[in-house]
């Protein structure tokens, strides 16, 4: 079952010794303890296959091996994102799929993996030394990226083995920052536990908030933390970058796609991909009473993570992606 990063509700301290400061020092260890326990190391794998029947056809498969909630997957090529990378496809588990030539047939395979077929000829054709990268945005891990390409000697019909951690590249600002905070927090937690070991343990009570509520927490953070979220991106390093794809991205467009960049070289800032759609908030959380998916039964072995989705303002059956409850 999924471990939710819920902080146990604490009984308010008795008036007197602890006071407000004491209450804060009691809450903080539990927050830090939860973060330390739930912190994991996610991975992204990428598999690239050249189809035997069509030498200009590639199948790219990407998967996420983390415990977080996947919000968006971006597949692209064309160099580092800040240096003219071109988005091939963007997949949202609930709000649909966008793909641009030469990409076709981008699909979710499972709740934690996607596939994409590339076909083309001439300027828009992929070639054997093209590197394809996939970036998964997840909460709380942040954005995680991996790249893959066919080995130079690959025969058509053979695929490169999935390439996980060796070329894993986290969104350094986010991940290192979170890692640093967690490391500091864990050290600080040990310090606090040592200081408080002679004190009686706080009494716990069940949380009075709806048990459903925290599951959508990735999608309605406070304004401050929401500003820190990134639209995921992925980059391609290739010597056969298509010359004709700069105009592949439509200007404007409906709903949450509207704010995607017209050129993938410009990294979106902030939560642009969902900024144009109002997200109903209830405090810092969003109610998921309208549905989404809940995991049924125990997770089978060797499966990827669950997904937590946007609560959809259009009503109870507007969801199409899964909500993983581990």
């Amino acid at each position: 079952m999924r471990t939710e990063a819920q902080v146990p509700a604490l009984q308010p301290p008795e008036p007197g010794l602890e006071g407000a400061m004491g209450h804060r020092t009691l809450v903080l260890p539990w927050v830090l303890l939860t973060l330390c326990v739930t912190a994991g190391t996610p991975e992204v794998w990428v598999q690239v296959r050249m189809e035997a029947t069509e030498l200009s056809s590639f199948t790219i498969r990407c998967g996420f091996l983390g415990s977080g909630s996947i919000s968006l997957v971006t597949v692209s090529w064309g160099g580092p994102n800040g240096a003219g990378g071109t988005t091939l496809a963007v997949l949202h588990p609930e709000r649909g799929i966008r793909q641009w030539a030469p990409a076709r047939q981008a699909r979710w395979e499972t709740q934690s993996s996607i596939s994409l077929i590339l076909e083309g000829s001439g300027a828009s054709s992929p070639c054997a030394n093209t590197t394809f990268c996939c970036k998964f945005a997840s909460f709380p891990e942040g954005s995680w990226e991996a790249c893959g390409s066919l080995p130079p000697s690959s025969d058509p019909g053979l695929s490169a083995p999935p390439t996980p951690a060796p070329i894993l590249r986290a969104d350094l600002a986010g991940i290192l920052g979170v890692s640093g905070v967690l490391l500091f927090g864990c050290v600080y937690l040990l310090h606090l536990l040592r200081r408080h070991k002679h004190r009686p343990a706080p009494r716990l009570q069940p949380s009075r908030t709806s048990p459903q509520a925290p599951r959508a927490r990735a999608w309605a953070p406070s304004q401050a933390s929401q500003a820190a979220l990134h639209v995921p991106y992925a980059t391609i390093n290739t010597s056969c970058r298509p010359a004709t794809l700069d105009t592949a991205h439509p200007h404007g467009g409906p709903s949450w796609w509207a704010s995607l960049p017209t050129h993938a070289a410009h990294r979106p800032q902030g939560p642009a991909a969902w900024a144009s759609t109002p997200i109903p908030a209830r405090g810092s959380f969003v109610s998921v009473e309208n549905g989404l998916y809940a995991q049924a039964g125990e997770r089978p072995p060797h499966t990827g993570p669950g997904l937590t989705l946007f609560p959809d303002p259009r009503g109870p059956r507007a969801m199409e992606g899964p909500l993983g409850v581990r």
Epitope: G96, R107, P254, S255, A296, R314, E320
Partner: antibody
């Protein structure tokens, strides 16, 4: 609310063609694959193929290549499937379905096609 | 194509009992299996996808498990309204394929 409204039942003669339509509403039509599935009487379900409305890209089950042709009209948010050279084996209920790959959550009500002389 | 096999065409059970339906894929499909319920005269209804993820509004008596090639769909406490045909489907690769269906009958 997502809705897929299919055209009414069809009675056609063997060798003829028929076009079934599916009008979508309640979502961004171009962002989701439109799948088509056939269910013969008392039998299981067969995936015919899908179309990506944003660019009209199609993917067919090999079994239905030459039998089915999928098209979309973005302006009217309508997906069509034309079936040709019909035989009695093609008598079935045909469904349009919206999806992204993770199963098929939204189904049309189905269109019954009866092929009979 | 990936062949999905539901070994039982019919399963008979009583209201209040539990029942499991199995589905086997002819090749590994990770966890990419969905389950549907179809009642007479209705379109199929998605219950689970990715082997074990319940769709919106699906009661929690419906559960699923499995990975690779063997999958199980379970109704923990059968109710009268569960009388239907249940289909498995692989959503791992196109062409997407369905099992032959298992009809749940109430004793």
């Amino acid at each position: 609310e997502v809705q897929l409204q299919q055209s009414g039942p069809e009675l056609v003669k063997p060798g003829a063609s028929v076009k079934i339509s599916c009008k979508a509403s309640g979502y961004t039509f171009t962002d989701y694959y439109m799948n088509w599935v056939r269910q013969s009487h008392g039998k299981s379900l067969e995936w015919i193929g899908d179309i990506y409305p944003n660019n009209g890209d199609t993917n067919y089950n090999q079994k239905f290549k030459g039998k089915a042709t999928l098209t979309v009209d973005k302006s009217s948010k309508t997906a069509d499937m034309e079936l040709r050279s019909l035989t009695s084996e093609d008598s079935a209920v045909y469904y349009c379905i919206r999806g992204v790959g993770l199963g098929f959550p939204y189904w049309g009500q189905g269109t019954l096609v009866t092929v009979s002389a | 194509d990936i062949v999905m096999t539901q070994s039982h065409k019919f399963i008979s059970t009583s209201v209040g009992d539990g029942v499991s339906i199995t589905c086997q894929a002819s090749q590994v499909v990770s966890t990419a299996v969905a389950w549907y319920q179809q009642k007479p005269g209705q379109s199929p209804r998605l219950l689970l996808h990715s082997a074990s993820f319940r769709y919106s509004g699906v009661p929690d008596r419906f559960t699923g498990s499995g990975s690779g090639t063997d999958f199980t769909f379970t109704i923990s406490t059968v109710q009268a309204e569960d009388l239907a045909v249940y289909y498995c489907q692989q959503h791992y690769r196109t062409p997407y394929t369905f099992g032959g269906g298992t009809k749940l009958e109430i004793k």
